[in-house]
Interface confidence: medium
């Protein structure tokens, strides 16, 4: 239904902004725990990994839930 | 300590309904996203539904799509699962999850048994 | 809706042996563009809520023994318990995050000897 339709889109918008939140919270985490890694002359590969997985989460978002593609979420969503 | 209590459960007829809820603590209940998986007893798990922490996001198995609605009061750190027209094959037990990272569900409540039989 | 194929459905090992626990999915669960595989592992034992053991196909949880590790991507992935513990009795299930519904694998169940 049109209902459900506007309910899934919502909770997929809603998702995304968590999501980026999320990405920003432990990218910063991760740069801040690079930096006292370094200055021991620690090296880690951890931040890339994480850097990967949130920079196309938004790209890949739309795949997580069957929509019809009238309500595909367009640019509007990739905020 | 995080914990997720679910209630609700019990024996319903064929056609009826039944509410389930699952009471949190221990977490920002209004910043998280909540789910309902289901197993049935000596069976595999089944996802059955997701909710956004606004709770005007809802996602639901093909499964229980129009017969079951998710919910949720974030004043009262509660999920809810409205299970109508029940049947048989909804016989199972029910498990509130939480995740604290988009993908795994890495926190989960006891379960509360549902039955549906005449 | 992405189906999940575990295999064995069950394994009986002696502690110290080590279990492989395999998942095939009917379709790719891999982003192309960031090649992470959104599988994850989880644990159940007898009368207990699913434990997550293991998230993006190879990342374990936190306080997790390290004799629990994950491995694959696209459509095969598995689950090794490198040195098998009285306590790792137990059903273990894949799941797929990529795309709705979230299926869920049938199960392996792993009994100890």
């Known amino acids: 239904s049109e209902a459900e339709d506007a309910s899934l889109l919502s909770f997929m918008q809603g998702y995304m902004k968590h999501a980026t939140k999320t990405a920003k919270d432990a990218l910063s985490s991760v740069q801040e725990s690079q930096v006292a890694q370094q200055a021991r002359g620690w090296v880690t590969d951890g931040f890339s990994s994480l850097k990967d997985y949130w920079s196309t989460v938004k790209d890949k978002f739309s795949e997580f839930w069957d929509l019809d593609p009238e309500v595909r979420p367009t640019s509007a969503v990739a905020a | 300590e995080l914990q997720l209590v679910e209630s609700g459960g019990g024996l319903v007829q064929p056609g009826g309904s039944l509410r389930l809820s699952c009471a949190a603590s221990?977490?920002?209940?209004?910043?998280?996203?909540l789910y309902w998986v289901r197993q049935v007893p000596g069976k595999g798990l089944e996802w059955v539904s997701g909710i956004n922490p606004a709770g005007d996001g809802r996602a639901y198995a093909t499964s229980v799509k129009g017969r079951f609605t998710i919910s949720r009061d974030n004043a009262k750190n509660t999920l809810y699962l409205q299970m109508n027209t029940l049947e048989s094959d909804d016989t199972a037990v029910y498990y509130c999850a939480t995740a604290s990272r988009v993908v795994a569900y890495d926190s989960w409540g006891q379960g509360t048994q549902v039955t549906v039989s005449s | 809706e992405i189906v999940l194929t575990q295999s064995p459905s069950s394994v009986t090992a002696s502690v110290g042996e080590k279990v492989t626990i395999n998942c095939k999915s009917s379709q790719s669960v891999e982003s192309g563009s960031d090649q992470k595989s959104y599988l994850n592992w989880y644990q159940q034992r007898p009368g207990q809520s699913p434990r997550l053991l293991i998230y993006?196909?190879?990342t374990q949880e936190s306080g997790i023994p390290d004799r629990f590790s994950g491995s694959g991507s696209t459509t095969d992935f598995t689950l090794t318990i490198s040195s098998v513990q009285p306590e790792d009795a137990a059903v273990y299930y894949c799941q797929q995050a990529y795309s709705a519904p979230f299926t869920f694998g049938q199960g392996t169940k792993v009994e100890l000897k």
């Open positions: 993006y196909a190879s």
């Open positions: 221990g977490f920002t209940f209004s910043n998280a996203y």
